[in-house]
Protein backbone atom coordinates (compact mmCIF):
# COMPACT_ATOMS: atom_id res chain seq x y z
CA UNK A 1 0.00 0.00 0.00
CA UNK A 2 2.80 2.39 0.89
CA UNK A 3 4.99 1.43 -2.02
CA UNK A 4 5.47 3.53 -5.13
CA UNK A 5 6.94 2.73 -8.53
CA UNK A 6 9.36 5.34 -9.88
CA UNK A 7 11.41 5.21 -13.04
CA UNK A 8 13.86 7.28 -14.98
CA UNK A 9 16.56 7.24 -17.62
CA UNK A 10 20.27 6.94 -17.00
CA UNK A 11 22.16 10.26 -16.93
CA UNK A 12 18.97 12.17 -16.18
CA UNK A 13 17.88 13.55 -12.84
CA UNK A 14 15.34 11.50 -10.91
CA UNK A 15 13.65 12.70 -7.74
CA UNK A 16 11.44 10.37 -5.74
CA UNK A 17 9.07 11.36 -2.95
CA UNK A 18 8.53 9.11 0.07
CA UNK A 19 5.11 7.46 -0.27
CA UNK A 20 4.50 8.13 3.45
CA UNK A 21 3.64 11.74 4.14
CA UNK A 22 4.44 13.71 7.27
CA UNK A 23 4.81 17.26 8.52
CA UNK A 24 7.82 19.18 7.14
CA UNK A 25 9.25 19.17 10.68
CA UNK A 26 9.40 15.36 10.80
CA UNK A 27 12.73 13.77 9.90
CA UNK A 28 12.87 11.26 7.09
CA UNK A 29 15.59 8.61 6.87
CA UNK A 30 16.26 6.78 3.62
CA UNK A 31 17.84 3.34 3.23
CA UNK A 32 18.78 1.10 0.35
CA UNK A 33 16.58 -1.91 1.21
CA UNK A 34 18.83 -4.66 -0.15
CA UNK A 35 21.76 -3.66 2.04
CA UNK A 36 19.91 -1.63 4.71
CA UNK A 37 22.59 0.98 4.06
CA UNK A 38 21.65 4.54 4.97
CA UNK A 39 21.41 7.05 2.10
CA UNK A 40 23.60 10.08 2.82
CA UNK A 41 22.14 13.56 3.11
CA UNK A 42 25.26 15.38 1.90
CA UNK A 43 24.55 17.05 -1.43
CA UNK A 44 28.02 16.25 -2.75
CA UNK A 45 26.86 12.64 -3.25
CA UNK A 46 25.33 11.64 -6.57
CA UNK A 47 22.47 9.94 -4.71
CA UNK A 48 21.36 11.72 -1.58
CA UNK A 49 18.32 12.18 0.66
CA UNK A 50 16.73 15.55 1.20
CA UNK A 51 13.87 15.19 3.66
CA UNK A 52 10.90 13.56 1.90
CA UNK A 53 12.85 13.46 -1.36
CA UNK A 54 15.43 11.01 -2.66
CA UNK A 55 17.58 12.54 -5.40
CA UNK A 56 19.55 10.80 -8.13
CA UNK A 57 21.72 13.47 -9.76
CA UNK A 58 22.12 11.96 -12.26
CA UNK A 59 20.64 8.45 -12.16
CA UNK A 60 22.50 5.29 -13.14
CA UNK A 61 21.12 1.89 -14.12
CA UNK A 62 22.83 0.41 -11.05
CA UNK A 63 20.66 2.62 -8.82
CA UNK A 64 17.67 0.41 -9.55
CA UNK A 65 16.19 -1.23 -6.48
CA UNK A 66 13.89 -0.73 -3.52
CA UNK A 67 14.51 2.18 -1.20
CA UNK A 68 12.99 2.46 2.27
CA UNK A 69 11.94 5.76 3.78
CA UNK A 70 11.05 6.11 7.45
CA UNK A 71 9.13 9.20 8.53
CA UNK A 72 9.96 9.82 12.18
CA UNK A 73 7.83 11.89 14.54
CA UNK A 74 8.01 12.15 18.32
CA UNK A 75 5.13 9.66 18.65
CA UNK A 76 5.36 7.29 15.67
CA UNK A 77 7.40 6.01 12.75
CA UNK A 78 5.91 5.45 9.29
CA UNK A 79 7.65 3.30 6.68
CA UNK A 80 7.31 3.59 2.91
CA UNK A 81 9.03 1.96 -0.05
CA UNK A 82 10.15 3.43 -3.35
CA UNK A 83 10.68 0.87 -6.10
CA UNK A 84 13.12 2.63 -8.43
CA UNK A 85 14.03 1.42 -11.92
CA UNK A 86 16.55 3.24 -14.07
CA UNK A 87 16.58 2.33 -17.76
CA UNK A 88 19.16 2.78 -20.46
CA UNK A 89 18.34 5.48 -22.99
CA UNK A 90 16.59 4.14 -26.10
CA UNK A 91 18.47 4.61 -29.35
CA UNK A 92 15.26 4.84 -31.39
CA UNK A 93 12.28 7.14 -31.02
CA UNK A 94 9.85 4.56 -29.68
CA UNK A 95 9.08 5.07 -25.98
CA UNK A 96 8.41 1.69 -24.36
CA UNK A 97 5.31 1.12 -22.24
CA UNK A 98 7.31 0.87 -19.02
CA UNK A 99 8.52 4.47 -19.38
CA UNK A 100 5.01 5.82 -19.89
CA UNK A 101 3.14 7.87 -17.34
CA UNK A 102 -0.66 7.72 -17.17
CA UNK A 103 -2.62 8.45 -20.34
CA UNK A 104 -4.56 11.69 -20.48
CA UNK A 105 -7.57 12.44 -22.65
CA UNK A 106 -8.45 15.69 -24.28
CA UNK A 107 -11.18 17.21 -26.39
CA UNK A 108 -11.84 20.43 -28.29
CA UNK A 109 -12.78 22.08 -25.00
CA UNK A 110 -9.97 20.74 -22.82
CA UNK A 111 -6.56 19.88 -24.17
CA UNK A 112 -4.07 20.29 -21.33
CA UNK A 113 -1.23 17.80 -21.08
CA UNK A 114 0.57 18.09 -17.76
CA UNK A 115 4.24 17.22 -17.54
CA UNK A 116 4.40 14.24 -15.13
CA UNK A 117 6.35 14.54 -11.84
CA UNK A 118 7.60 18.06 -12.67
CA UNK A 119 6.46 19.44 -9.30
CA UNK A 120 9.26 17.45 -7.62
CA UNK A 121 11.97 19.37 -9.48
CA UNK A 122 13.56 22.81 -9.34
CA UNK A 123 12.94 23.89 -12.92
CA UNK A 124 12.44 27.08 -14.84
CA UNK A 125 10.17 27.71 -17.82
CA UNK A 126 9.83 27.14 -20.65
CA UNK A 127 9.30 23.43 -20.96
CA UNK A 128 10.22 21.74 -24.23
CA UNK A 129 7.56 19.47 -25.71
CA UNK A 130 7.89 16.70 -28.29
CA UNK A 131 5.27 14.50 -29.98
CA UNK A 132 6.47 11.11 -31.15
CA UNK A 133 9.99 12.52 -30.77
CA UNK A 134 9.39 15.54 -33.01
CA UNK A 135 9.73 19.00 -31.44
CA UNK A 136 6.32 20.69 -31.44
CA UNK A 137 6.14 23.73 -33.67
CA UNK A 138 3.30 25.99 -34.67
CA UNK A 139 0.88 28.42 -33.08
CA UNK A 140 -1.52 25.63 -32.00
CA UNK A 141 0.95 24.50 -29.32
CA UNK A 142 1.46 26.61 -26.21
CA UNK A 143 3.81 25.61 -23.41
CA UNK A 144 2.22 27.15 -20.34
CA UNK A 145 3.77 26.66 -16.89
CA UNK A 146 3.91 22.90 -16.31
CA UNK A 147 1.52 21.90 -19.08
CA UNK A 148 1.03 21.99 -22.83
CA UNK A 149 -2.12 23.47 -24.35
CA UNK A 150 -3.21 22.38 -27.83
CA UNK A 151 -5.63 24.65 -29.64
CA UNK A 152 -8.32 23.20 -31.93
CA UNK A 153 -7.61 19.61 -30.95
CA UNK A 154 -7.98 17.04 -33.75
CA UNK A 155 -7.82 13.26 -33.76
CA UNK A 156 -4.36 13.57 -35.33
CA UNK A 157 -3.13 15.10 -32.06
CA UNK A 158 -3.34 11.73 -30.32
CA UNK A 159 0.07 10.25 -29.59
CA UNK A 160 2.96 10.16 -27.15
CA UNK A 161 4.02 13.52 -25.74
CA UNK A 162 7.37 14.06 -24.04
CA UNK A 163 8.21 17.03 -21.86
CA UNK A 164 11.84 17.95 -21.33
CA UNK A 165 13.13 20.34 -18.68
CA UNK A 166 16.25 21.18 -16.70
CA UNK A 167 16.50 20.54 -12.96
CA UNK A 168 18.88 22.85 -11.14
CA UNK A 169 20.64 21.71 -7.98
CA UNK A 170 23.24 24.00 -6.43
CA UNK A 171 24.10 25.54 -9.78
CA UNK A 172 24.41 22.21 -11.60
CA UNK A 173 21.91 21.43 -14.37
CA UNK A 174 20.40 18.01 -15.07
CA UNK A 175 18.07 17.02 -17.88
CA UNK A 176 14.71 15.30 -17.19
CA UNK A 177 12.26 13.83 -19.70
CA UNK A 178 8.83 12.31 -19.08
CA UNK A 179 6.40 10.82 -21.60
CA UNK A 180 2.67 10.17 -21.53
CA UNK A 181 0.04 9.25 -24.09
CA UNK A 182 -2.63 11.69 -25.13
CA UNK A 183 -5.90 10.45 -26.56
CA UNK A 184 -8.52 12.62 -28.20
CA UNK A 185 -12.16 12.21 -27.21
CA UNK A 186 -14.74 13.39 -29.65
CA UNK A 187 -17.17 15.58 -27.71
CA UNK A 188 -19.98 13.65 -29.40
CA UNK A 189 -19.28 10.47 -27.53
CA UNK A 190 -16.92 8.46 -25.38
CA UNK A 191 -16.88 5.26 -23.39
CA UNK A 192 -15.81 4.65 -19.84
CA UNK A 193 -15.54 1.84 -17.33
CA UNK A 194 -19.11 0.69 -16.55
CA UNK A 195 -20.85 2.45 -13.67
CA UNK A 196 -23.64 0.43 -12.05
CA UNK A 197 -26.41 2.70 -10.82
CA UNK A 198 -28.59 -0.10 -9.43
CA UNK A 199 -28.49 -2.24 -7.45
CA UNK A 200 -26.13 -0.93 -4.80
CA UNK A 201 -23.20 -3.20 -4.00
CA UNK A 202 -24.21 -5.92 -1.48
CA UNK A 203 -27.80 -4.69 -1.44
CA UNK A 204 -30.34 -6.71 0.50
CA UNK A 205 -33.68 -6.83 -1.31
CA UNK A 206 -36.73 -7.72 0.72
CA UNK A 207 -39.18 -10.10 -0.99
CA UNK A 208 -42.34 -11.91 0.03
CA UNK A 209 -42.44 -15.68 -0.21
CA UNK A 210 -44.99 -16.77 -2.83
CA UNK A 211 -45.07 -13.38 -4.55
CA UNK A 212 -43.28 -12.22 -7.69
CA UNK A 213 -40.12 -10.07 -7.46
CA UNK A 214 -38.21 -7.96 -9.98
CA UNK A 215 -34.55 -6.96 -9.77
CA UNK A 216 -33.21 -4.28 -12.14
CA UNK A 217 -29.56 -4.13 -13.19
CA UNK A 218 -28.80 -0.66 -14.55
CA UNK A 219 -25.42 0.63 -15.72
CA UNK A 220 -24.00 3.50 -17.74
CA UNK A 221 -21.11 3.18 -20.18
CA UNK A 222 -20.31 6.63 -21.51
CA UNK A 223 -21.81 9.20 -23.82
CA UNK A 224 -23.30 8.46 -27.23
CA UNK A 225 -23.51 5.15 -29.08
CA UNK A 226 -21.65 2.36 -27.29
CA UNK A 227 -19.73 -0.42 -29.02
CA UNK A 228 -19.92 -3.80 -27.26
CA UNK A 229 -21.60 -2.96 -23.97
CA UNK A 230 -23.90 -5.21 -22.01
CA UNK A 231 -25.67 -5.76 -18.70
CA UNK A 232 -26.81 -9.15 -17.47
CA UNK A 233 -27.69 -11.13 -14.38
CA UNK A 234 -25.92 -14.18 -13.00
CA UNK A 235 -27.13 -16.63 -10.36
CA UNK A 236 -24.40 -18.08 -8.14
CA UNK A 237 -21.90 -17.11 -10.85
CA UNK A 238 -23.86 -18.85 -13.61
CA UNK A 239 -25.71 -17.32 -16.59
CA UNK A 240 -29.47 -17.30 -16.07
CA UNK A 241 -30.03 -19.48 -19.15
CA UNK A 242 -27.60 -22.08 -17.79
CA UNK A 243 -28.95 -22.07 -14.23
CA UNK A 244 -32.04 -24.04 -15.20
CA UNK A 245 -34.67 -22.50 -12.93
CA UNK A 246 -37.66 -21.62 -15.15
CA UNK A 247 -39.19 -19.37 -12.46
CA UNK A 248 -36.19 -17.03 -12.72
CA UNK A 249 -35.93 -15.32 -16.10
CA UNK A 250 -34.04 -12.39 -17.55
CA UNK A 251 -35.97 -9.98 -19.75
CA UNK A 252 -35.28 -10.49 -23.44
CA UNK A 253 -33.06 -7.71 -24.77
CA UNK A 254 -31.57 -4.74 -22.96
CA UNK A 255 -33.40 -1.45 -22.60
CA UNK A 256 -31.31 1.56 -23.58
CA UNK A 257 -31.83 4.78 -21.71
CA UNK A 258 -30.01 8.08 -21.31
CA UNK A 259 -29.22 9.53 -17.90
CA UNK A 260 -27.55 12.96 -17.73
CA UNK A 261 -26.48 12.44 -21.33
CA UNK A 262 -24.89 9.07 -20.51
CA UNK A 263 -25.78 5.90 -22.40
CA UNK A 264 -27.20 3.35 -19.97
CA UNK A 265 -28.57 -0.18 -20.22
CA UNK A 266 -31.14 -1.89 -18.00
CA UNK A 267 -31.85 -5.60 -17.54
CA UNK A 268 -34.73 -6.86 -15.40
CA UNK A 269 -34.58 -10.19 -13.59
CA UNK A 270 -38.04 -11.60 -12.90
CA UNK A 271 -38.55 -14.14 -10.12
CA UNK A 272 -41.97 -15.78 -10.14
CA UNK A 273 -43.46 -17.28 -6.97
CA UNK A 274 -40.47 -16.53 -4.70
CA UNK A 275 -39.39 -19.60 -2.73
CA UNK A 276 -37.28 -20.05 0.41
CA UNK A 277 -34.40 -21.48 -1.61
CA UNK A 278 -34.23 -18.28 -3.68
CA UNK A 279 -33.04 -16.50 -0.53
CA UNK A 280 -29.89 -18.66 -0.52
CA UNK A 281 -28.81 -17.61 -4.00
CA UNK A 282 -26.34 -14.88 -4.92
CA UNK A 283 -27.66 -12.50 -7.57
CA UNK A 284 -24.96 -10.67 -9.56
CA UNK A 285 -25.64 -7.65 -11.73
CA UNK A 286 -22.84 -7.53 -14.31
CA UNK A 287 -21.98 -4.60 -16.56
CA UNK A 288 -19.23 -4.91 -19.10
CA UNK A 289 -17.71 -3.19 -22.09
CA UNK A 290 -14.28 -2.93 -23.66
CA UNK A 291 -12.90 -1.21 -20.58
CA UNK A 292 -13.77 -4.10 -18.31
CA UNK A 293 -16.32 -5.73 -16.06
CA UNK A 294 -18.08 -4.46 -12.94
CA UNK A 295 -20.18 -6.64 -10.65
CA UNK A 296 -22.70 -5.75 -7.93
CA UNK A 297 -24.09 -8.50 -5.72
CA UNK A 298 -27.62 -8.64 -4.32
CA UNK A 299 -29.12 -11.05 -1.84
CA UNK A 300 -32.77 -11.58 -1.06
CA UNK A 301 -34.25 -11.53 2.40
CA UNK A 302 -37.71 -12.40 3.59
CA UNK A 303 -39.98 -9.43 4.13
CA UNK A 304 -41.78 -10.00 7.40
CA UNK A 305 -45.56 -9.71 6.94
CA UNK A 306 -46.90 -6.81 9.00
CA UNK A 307 -48.27 -8.11 12.29
CA UNK A 308 -51.82 -6.72 12.59
CA UNK A 309 -52.35 -8.22 16.05
CA UNK A 310 -51.91 -5.96 19.02
Amino acid sequence: KFSKQSWGLENEALIVRCPRQGKPSYTVDWYYSQTNKSIPTQERNRVFASGQLLKFLPAAVADSGIYTCIVRSPTFNRTGYANVTIYKKQSDCNVPDYLMYSTVSGSEKNSKIYCPTIDLYNWTAPLEWFKNCQALQGSRYRAHKSFLVIDNVMTEDAGDYTCKFIHNENGANYSVTATRSFTVKDEQGFSLFPVIGAPAQNEIKEVEIGKNANLTCSACFGKGTQFLAAVLWQLNGTKITDFGEPRIQQEEGQNQSFSNGLACLDMVLRIADVKEEDLLLQYDCLALNLHGLRRHTVRLSRKNPIDHHS
Partner: antibody, heavy 126, light 107 residues
Framework: EVQLLESGGGLVQPGGSLRLSCAAS????????MNWVRQAPGKGLEWVST????????YYADSVKGRFTISRDNSKNTLYLQMNSLRAEDTAVYYC???????????????????WGQGTLVTVSS | DIQMTQSPSSLSASVGDRVTITCRAS??????LNWYQQKPGKAPKLLIY???TLQSGVPSRFSGSGSGTDFTLTISSLQPEDFATYYC?????????FGGGTKVEIK
Amino acid sequence: EVQLLESGGGLVQPGGSLRLSCAASGFTFTDAWMNWVRQAPGKGLEWVSTISVSVGVTYYADSVKGRFTISRDNSKNTLYLQMNSLRAEDTAVYYCATIGSMATIRKGATDAFDIWGQGTLVTVSS
Amino acid sequence: DIQMTQSPSSLSASVGDRVTITCRASQRINSYLNWYQQKPGKAPKLLIYAASTLQSGVPSRFSGSGSGTDFTLTISSLQPEDFATYYCQQSYSTPPTFGGGTKVEIK
Protein backbone atom coordinates in the same frame (compact mmCIF):
# COMPACT_ATOMS: atom_id res chain seq x y z
CA GLU B 1 4.31 -14.59 -27.86
CA VAL B 2 0.70 -13.60 -28.54
CA GLN B 3 -0.89 -16.18 -30.83
CA LEU B 4 -4.23 -17.39 -32.18
CA LEU B 5 -4.44 -20.71 -33.99
CA GLU B 6 -7.60 -21.76 -35.85
CA SER B 7 -8.55 -25.29 -36.81
CA GLY B 8 -11.58 -27.32 -37.87
CA GLY B 9 -12.12 -25.99 -41.39
CA GLY B 10 -12.85 -28.26 -44.31
CA LEU B 11 -15.34 -29.31 -47.00
CA VAL B 12 -18.95 -29.72 -45.93
CA GLN B 13 -22.21 -30.21 -47.82
CA PRO B 14 -24.97 -27.57 -47.80
CA GLY B 15 -27.12 -28.03 -44.70
CA GLY B 16 -24.22 -29.65 -42.86
CA SER B 17 -22.40 -28.62 -39.69
CA LEU B 18 -18.83 -27.80 -38.71
CA ARG B 19 -17.13 -26.64 -35.52
CA LEU B 20 -14.16 -24.27 -35.70
CA SER B 21 -11.68 -23.88 -32.84
CA CYS B 22 -9.24 -21.11 -32.02
CA ALA B 23 -6.51 -21.73 -29.45
CA ALA B 24 -5.26 -18.55 -27.77
CA SER B 25 -1.93 -18.05 -26.01
CA GLY B 26 0.36 -15.27 -24.82
CA PHE B 27 -2.31 -13.00 -23.31
CA THR B 28 -4.99 -13.03 -20.64
CA PHE B 29 -7.82 -14.79 -22.45
CA THR B 30 -10.51 -13.68 -19.98
CA ASP B 31 -9.66 -10.00 -20.57
CA ALA B 32 -10.46 -10.24 -24.26
CA TRP B 33 -13.49 -9.96 -26.46
CA MET B 34 -13.04 -12.73 -29.02
CA ASN B 35 -14.38 -12.58 -32.56
CA TRP B 36 -14.85 -14.51 -35.77
CA VAL B 37 -14.34 -12.59 -39.02
CA ARG B 38 -14.66 -14.25 -42.42
CA GLN B 39 -13.50 -13.57 -45.94
CA ALA B 40 -15.14 -15.18 -48.97
CA PRO B 41 -12.70 -16.05 -51.80
CA GLY B 42 -11.60 -12.84 -53.56
CA LYS B 43 -13.90 -10.73 -51.38
CA GLY B 44 -13.60 -8.37 -48.43
CA LEU B 45 -13.78 -8.92 -44.67
CA GLU B 46 -17.08 -9.60 -42.89
CA TRP B 47 -17.57 -9.69 -39.12
CA VAL B 48 -19.42 -12.83 -37.99
CA SER B 49 -19.64 -12.94 -34.20
CA THR B 50 -18.23 -11.65 -30.89
CA ILE B 51 -18.13 -13.05 -27.35
CA SER B 52 -16.95 -11.45 -24.12
CA VAL B 53 -14.73 -14.17 -22.70
CA SER B 54 -15.26 -13.12 -19.08
CA VAL B 55 -19.04 -13.65 -18.95
CA GLY B 56 -20.07 -14.99 -22.33
CA VAL B 57 -22.17 -12.14 -23.75
CA THR B 58 -22.57 -12.81 -27.49
CA TYR B 59 -23.26 -10.81 -30.67
CA TYR B 60 -23.97 -12.13 -34.19
CA ALA B 61 -24.18 -10.78 -37.72
CA ASP B 62 -27.72 -11.01 -39.14
CA SER B 63 -26.45 -13.33 -41.88
CA VAL B 64 -25.53 -16.09 -39.35
CA LYS B 65 -27.98 -15.46 -36.48
CA GLY B 66 -29.80 -18.64 -35.47
CA ARG B 67 -27.36 -20.86 -37.41
CA PHE B 68 -23.97 -20.12 -35.81
CA THR B 69 -23.09 -20.25 -32.10
CA ILE B 70 -19.96 -18.68 -30.63
CA SER B 71 -18.65 -20.10 -27.35
CA ARG B 72 -15.45 -20.43 -25.36
CA ASP B 73 -13.73 -22.73 -22.87
CA ASN B 74 -11.80 -20.52 -20.46
CA SER B 75 -9.95 -23.48 -18.93
CA LYS B 76 -8.54 -24.33 -22.38
CA ASN B 77 -8.13 -20.72 -23.62
CA THR B 78 -10.11 -21.78 -26.67
CA LEU B 79 -12.77 -20.07 -28.77
CA TYR B 80 -15.32 -22.04 -30.83
CA LEU B 81 -17.74 -21.40 -33.68
CA GLN B 82 -20.43 -24.03 -34.14
CA MET B 83 -21.81 -23.65 -37.68
CA ASN B 84 -25.09 -25.37 -38.53
CA SER B 85 -27.34 -25.29 -41.63
CA LEU B 86 -24.36 -24.24 -43.73
CA ARG B 87 -24.94 -22.56 -47.09
CA ALA B 88 -22.75 -22.04 -50.15
CA GLU B 89 -22.43 -18.35 -49.24
CA ASP B 90 -20.75 -19.32 -45.95
CA THR B 91 -17.72 -20.50 -47.94
CA ALA B 92 -14.83 -18.38 -46.67
CA VAL B 93 -11.62 -18.25 -44.72
CA TYR B 94 -12.61 -17.84 -41.07
CA TYR B 95 -10.30 -15.84 -38.84
CA CYS B 96 -10.48 -15.52 -35.10
CA ALA B 97 -9.40 -12.12 -33.78
CA THR B 98 -9.24 -10.36 -30.44
CA ILE B 99 -10.42 -6.96 -29.31
CA GLY B 100 -8.84 -5.40 -26.24
CA SER B 101 -6.38 -8.07 -25.24
CA MET B 102 -3.15 -6.14 -25.43
CA ALA B 103 -1.32 -3.29 -23.73
CA THR B 104 -2.82 -1.24 -26.58
CA ILE B 105 -5.72 -0.63 -24.21
CA ARG B 106 -3.47 2.03 -22.68
CA LYS B 107 -3.64 3.95 -25.92
CA GLY B 108 -7.31 3.42 -26.55
CA ALA B 109 -7.13 0.64 -29.14
CA THR B 110 -9.63 -1.48 -27.29
CA ASP B 111 -12.09 -1.38 -30.17
CA ALA B 112 -9.80 -2.60 -32.96
CA PHE B 113 -9.19 -6.21 -34.01
CA ASP B 114 -5.62 -6.22 -32.74
CA ILE B 115 -4.57 -9.87 -33.00
CA TRP B 116 -5.55 -12.25 -35.82
CA GLY B 117 -5.13 -15.96 -36.37
CA GLN B 118 -3.89 -17.38 -39.67
CA GLY B 119 -7.40 -18.44 -40.73
CA THR B 120 -9.07 -21.74 -41.60
CA LEU B 121 -10.90 -22.41 -44.88
CA VAL B 122 -14.51 -23.57 -44.82
CA THR B 123 -15.91 -24.78 -48.15
CA VAL B 124 -19.64 -25.48 -48.44
CA SER B 125 -20.33 -27.40 -51.62
CA SER B 126 -22.11 -30.50 -52.84
CA ASP C 1 -25.85 -0.91 -39.96
CA ILE C 2 -23.15 1.61 -40.82
CA GLN C 3 -21.88 1.27 -44.40
CA MET C 4 -18.18 1.89 -45.08
CA THR C 5 -17.19 2.94 -48.62
CA GLN C 6 -13.55 2.83 -49.68
CA SER C 7 -12.04 4.46 -52.73
CA PRO C 8 -10.41 3.70 -55.00
CA SER C 9 -11.04 -0.04 -55.09
CA SER C 10 -7.60 -0.49 -56.63
CA LEU C 11 -4.65 1.67 -57.61
CA SER C 12 -1.28 1.24 -59.29
CA ALA C 13 1.75 3.00 -57.87
CA SER C 14 5.53 2.88 -57.89
CA VAL C 15 8.02 2.51 -55.06
CA GLY C 16 8.54 5.93 -53.48
CA ASP C 17 5.10 7.25 -54.45
CA ARG C 18 2.78 8.93 -51.99
CA VAL C 19 -0.47 6.95 -51.79
CA THR C 20 -3.79 8.09 -50.34
CA ILE C 21 -6.81 5.87 -49.67
CA THR C 22 -10.12 7.29 -48.49
CA CYS C 23 -12.91 5.76 -46.44
CA ARG C 24 -16.37 7.24 -45.95
CA ALA C 25 -18.91 6.20 -43.31
CA SER C 26 -22.65 6.37 -43.93
CA GLN C 27 -23.06 8.26 -40.63
CA ARG C 28 -20.82 10.04 -38.13
CA ILE C 29 -18.49 7.63 -36.34
CA ASN C 30 -16.36 10.21 -34.51
CA SER C 31 -12.82 8.76 -34.52
CA TYR C 32 -13.79 5.09 -34.21
CA LEU C 33 -12.04 4.06 -37.41
CA ASN C 34 -9.33 1.42 -37.85
CA TRP C 35 -7.13 0.53 -40.83
CA TYR C 36 -5.80 -2.94 -41.70
CA GLN C 37 -3.28 -4.26 -44.22
CA GLN C 38 -3.70 -7.70 -45.79
CA LYS C 39 -1.24 -9.51 -48.03
CA PRO C 40 -2.33 -12.45 -50.23
CA GLY C 41 -2.85 -15.64 -48.25
CA LYS C 42 -2.24 -13.88 -44.94
CA ALA C 43 -4.40 -12.59 -42.11
CA PRO C 44 -5.13 -8.86 -41.86
CA LYS C 45 -2.82 -6.77 -39.68
CA LEU C 46 -3.86 -3.73 -37.65
CA LEU C 47 -2.08 -0.60 -38.90
CA ILE C 48 -3.92 2.35 -37.40
CA TYR C 49 -6.61 2.64 -34.75
CA ALA C 50 -8.72 5.53 -33.47
CA ALA C 51 -8.38 7.13 -36.94
CA SER C 52 -4.81 8.33 -36.50
CA THR C 53 -2.86 6.32 -33.92
CA LEU C 54 -0.16 4.06 -35.32
CA GLN C 55 -0.20 0.51 -33.97
CA SER C 56 3.06 -0.50 -32.29
CA GLY C 57 5.68 -1.68 -34.79
CA VAL C 58 4.03 -0.09 -37.84
CA PRO C 59 6.41 2.10 -39.88
CA SER C 60 5.90 5.86 -39.57
CA ARG C 61 5.36 6.23 -43.34
CA PHE C 62 1.79 5.13 -42.61
CA SER C 63 -0.55 7.80 -41.24
CA GLY C 64 -4.27 8.20 -40.74
CA SER C 65 -6.48 11.24 -40.44
CA GLY C 66 -10.10 12.27 -40.37
CA SER C 67 -13.06 12.40 -38.03
CA GLY C 68 -16.82 12.18 -38.40
CA THR C 69 -17.52 10.53 -41.76
CA ASP C 70 -14.40 11.05 -43.91
CA PHE C 71 -11.08 9.34 -43.26
CA THR C 72 -7.78 8.97 -45.05
CA LEU C 73 -4.91 6.48 -44.96
CA THR C 74 -1.66 7.86 -46.37
CA ILE C 75 1.55 6.03 -47.23
CA SER C 76 4.14 8.80 -47.57
CA SER C 77 6.69 6.78 -49.56
CA LEU C 78 5.52 3.43 -50.87
CA GLN C 79 7.89 0.52 -50.16
CA PRO C 80 7.95 -2.89 -51.93
CA GLU C 81 6.43 -4.57 -48.86
CA ASP C 82 3.46 -2.16 -48.88
CA PHE C 83 1.83 -3.70 -51.95
CA ALA C 84 -1.27 -5.24 -50.37
CA THR C 85 -4.99 -4.69 -49.81
CA TYR C 86 -6.07 -2.13 -47.23
CA TYR C 87 -9.35 -2.16 -45.30
CA CYS C 88 -11.03 0.41 -43.09
CA GLN C 89 -13.38 -0.67 -40.29
CA GLN C 90 -15.70 1.23 -37.97
CA SER C 91 -15.99 0.35 -34.31
CA TYR C 92 -18.55 3.03 -33.44
CA SER C 93 -21.48 0.65 -33.16
CA THR C 94 -22.36 -3.02 -33.43
CA PRO C 95 -22.09 -4.66 -35.91
CA PRO C 96 -18.53 -3.62 -36.76
CA THR C 97 -18.33 -3.13 -40.53
CA PHE C 98 -15.47 -3.07 -43.03
CA GLY C 99 -14.90 -1.13 -46.21
CA GLY C 100 -14.67 -3.08 -49.46
CA GLY C 101 -10.88 -2.80 -49.57
CA THR C 102 -8.32 -1.00 -51.72
CA LYS C 103 -5.76 -3.08 -53.60
CA VAL C 104 -2.40 -1.33 -54.02
CA GLU C 105 -0.56 -2.84 -57.00
CA ILE C 106 2.82 -2.26 -58.59
CA LYS C 107 2.70 0.04 -61.61
